[in-house]
Every structure is written in C-alpha cells, then in structure tokens.
C-alpha cells in the first residue's frame, strides 16, 4: 500500500477519506487504527456502527469520529481539534471476522497554526529535505498534490 498524507492545522478539524470498492467490501464494518511505527501493531481508535446497515451513523471516540458511505464506498474519519500528538501513521481497515484488510495507509501531519503568533520564528513551512516515498498528499483544504510532489520529510 502507498501512503496518503493528510495535513491539517493545529486546533482545526481534519477530514480523512478512504475510498474502497463498495461491492468487494459489502457487509463489512470499517475501522480506523493508529499504527505504532511503520512496522508496529495497529491500535483501534474507532470503528463503524455494529450494525452494518447503520454504518452511515457517525461514531465517535474522543475527538475522532467515523462514518461510512457504504453505497458510495467512502469511509470518512474526522479528527477534531487537531493536536501535535495526533500526528502519525494510521490505517483505514475493512473488518471481516477477526481479520482486517487495509483500505488505505495514512500519515497525518499537524501543521502549526499560521495565525498563532506565540513564536512566529517556529512556524513550520514543510521543507523538501526528503520525500516520503510513494506518498500522496491531501491538505485539510482538500487540495491534492500530484504524486511525487511531497513537500515534507518523513517522520519518526
């Protein structure tokens, strides 16, 4: 799986979308999990409604919400009041039994609020020191960069 990068601004909301084949994943619940390192385990954050037919209903765990358009084939995760500690590697998953298929690997980047003047010298303009291989960037304002046009380095 390639990694899709979603960049949001600290304190604002970030919407992550995970498209999938609605026929292939018919009847399956979905989940959003946080991965502990690129090769580490993925810890469940929130999952869609226990009844698949009610997957369109928003479910929430803390500041993270999930909803599934099962007909259109789009899982949407919303991270409210984005904080630096929300940054990291995540997965959208399709559940079947005790197994989980990865729909999309996601890297969430939290950008400093440009309107926060606590220390203008610390404002982060994503650099070009090293691209995140095979990544695709989506900003919280829904502007997608072209493949390979990654404006920031990978993280640890």
């Amino acid at each position: 799986h390639n990694t899709t990068v979603f960049q949001g601004v600290e304190g604002q909301s970030l919407q992550v979308s995970c498209p999938y084949d609605s026929m292939k994943h018919w009847g399956r619940r979905k989940a959003w999990c946080r991965q502990l390192g690129e090769k580490g385990p993925c810890q469940r954050v929130v999952s869609t409604h226990n009844l698949w037919l009610l997957s369109f209903l928003r479910r929430r765990n803390g500041s993270t919400a999930i909803t599934d358009d099962t007909l259109g084939g789009t899982l949407t995760i919303t991270l409210r009041n984005l904080q630096p500690h929300d940054a990291g590697f995540y997965q959208c998953q399709s559940l079947h039994g005790s197994e989980a298929d990865t729909l999309r690997k996601v890297l969430v980047e939290v950008l400093a609020d440009p309107l926060d003047h606590r220390d203008a010298g610390d404002l982060w303009v994503p650099g070009e020191s090293e691209s995140f291989e095979d990544a695709h960037v989506e900003h919280s304002i829904s502007r997608s960069l072209l493949e390979g046009e990654i404006p920031f380095p990978p993280t640890s």
Epitope: G37, K39, F89, W124, P154, T155
Partner: antibody, heavy 120, light 107 residues
Framework: QVQLVQSGAEVKKPGASVKVSCKAS????????IHWVRQAPGQGLEWMGW????????KYAPKFQGRVTITADTSTSTAYMELSSLRSEDTAVYYC?????????????WGQGTLVTVSS | DIQMTQSPSSLSASVGDRVTITCHAS??????LSWYQQKPGKAPKLLIY???NLHTGVPSRFSGSGSGTDFTLTISSLQPEDFATYYC?????????FGQGTKVEIK
C-alpha cells in the same frame, strides 16, 4: 527472551575494513528496522544508517555514505554493518538497534555494543 | 541535517531533586522526538517516545513534553539510579540525529 547479540571487539589498521554482526533472537528481524549507531570514546551517539531486512532497503547518514554498507540475512536473523577505509577517528563502540521505524515505534532493542579500535 | 541542541551539557543534582533537560531542534519536528538514558559501558535505553509517551517499564517520575522545536525531559524526583547521560533524538527525517547529551551527576 528478546535480544540483539553483537560480534566481539575488533582491532584494525587504518585503511582496513571491519564487519560487525548483530544477531536477533526472540523476534523476527523482518518485522523491524535495524539501525547502526556509534559512540566514540567519551563522545555522544551518532546514527549511521538503517536497513529494512524485509526488502533489503537501506539508508545511510551522508557522513558515512560510500564507506558504510548495512546488510541483513533474514535466514539467520542477522544484520551486518561494514565500514571501510578505517581511520583512527572511527575508533568507537558500534551498536545495532531495532525498532518499528517512524511514527511512534514502541519497540526498542539494542545490542551490547562492539568496540572497534583503529590503530597502526 | 536537523541539529539537536541539548542544555545543559551537564548538571549536578541531589537525590530527590527535580531535574529538567531541554532539547532544541533546528527545524520543526512535530512530536517525533525520543529521549534515551545511557549509563557508562551500557547501550542507550529508551525512556520517552513521541515527545511525551513513557516507554514500557520506565518509572513515572520521568516525563516528556513539547512539540515543534522545543522539548523537555523532566525527572520529578531524582533517584540514585538516574545518574547517567541523557540524549534526545529526532526522528522527523533521516539522518536521525542526537543531541550532544546531558550528564546528570551527583552533587
């Protein structure tokens, strides 16, 4: 028991090469990234590079590029670090270090260190 | 490369003291910072990952904070076994880089 066991101390002459091994037990190295970090006597820690044993991809610090080669043999769960064109300032303890990579790895294992002395 | 600057480079403290070590990154590194403890002749030991997360088995007197460029490691009540050298390491980009270390000595 999860551990990384490194090869023994080495004494080398300037211009020679050294190859240090790091054998993992209690876990599969394919599930981790293996890093190499060195520490000169009385000095701080210096990251040299890493390998993803799963696919053999490696990445090196610019300072060591062209002089260091990191490899891994998944059949023996062993990683190797070879440093060539040795000079006296390469005298250091070399550590291998396993983690799950970026984005908040909670796994962190270190070898016991291998002292490499470069002296004529 | 991202430069990591620790301060102080050394400090003397007594058992029971509250100790604070800071680490400054030359570029924004979000929360991708780890803190290590190293004792003479031993390998480093991970204390804190992702700026503020306590590694398994690490006593709760250790805590980390910060994001962006400025980070802090705090030992709330120094114990005899805490006398060691502490390093910060950034993982925002490769090459990973360490701070120069802070040696905590007995006063």
């Amino acid at each position: 028991q999860v551990q990384l066991v490194q090869s023994g101390a080495e004494v080398k002459k300037p211009g020679a090469s050294v190859k240090v091994s790091c054998k993992a037990s209690g876990f599969s190295i394919e599930d981790f990234y293996i890093h190499w970090v060195r520490q000169a006597p009385g000095q701080g820690l210096e990251w040299m590079g890493w390998i993803d044993p799963e696919n053999g991809e490696s990445k090196y610090a610019p300072k060591f590029q062209g002089r260091v080669t990191i490899t891994a043999d998944t059949s023996t769960s062993t990683a190797y670090m070879e440093l060539s064109s040795l000079r006296s300032e390469d005298t250091a303890v070399y550590y291998c270090h396993a983690d799950h990579g970026n984005y908040g790895s909670t796994m962190d294992y270190w070898g016991q260190g291998t002292l490499v002395t470069v002296s004529s | 490369d991202i430069q990591m600057t620790q301060s102080p480079s050394s400090l003397s403290a007594s058992v029971g003291d509250r100790v604070t070590i800071t680490c400054h990154a030359s570029q924004h590194i979000n929360v991708w910072l780890s803190w290590y403890q190293q004792k003479p002749g031993k390998a480093p030991k991970l204390l804190i990952y992702k700026a503020s997360n306590l590694h398994t088995g690490v006593p709760s007197r250790f805590s980390g904070s910060g994001s962006g460029t400025d980070f802090t490691l705090t030992i709330s009540s120094l114990q005899p076994e805490d006398f060691a050298t502490y390093y910060c390491q950034q993982g925002q980009t490769y090459p990973r880089t360490f701070g120069q270390g802070t040696k905590v000595e007995i006063k």
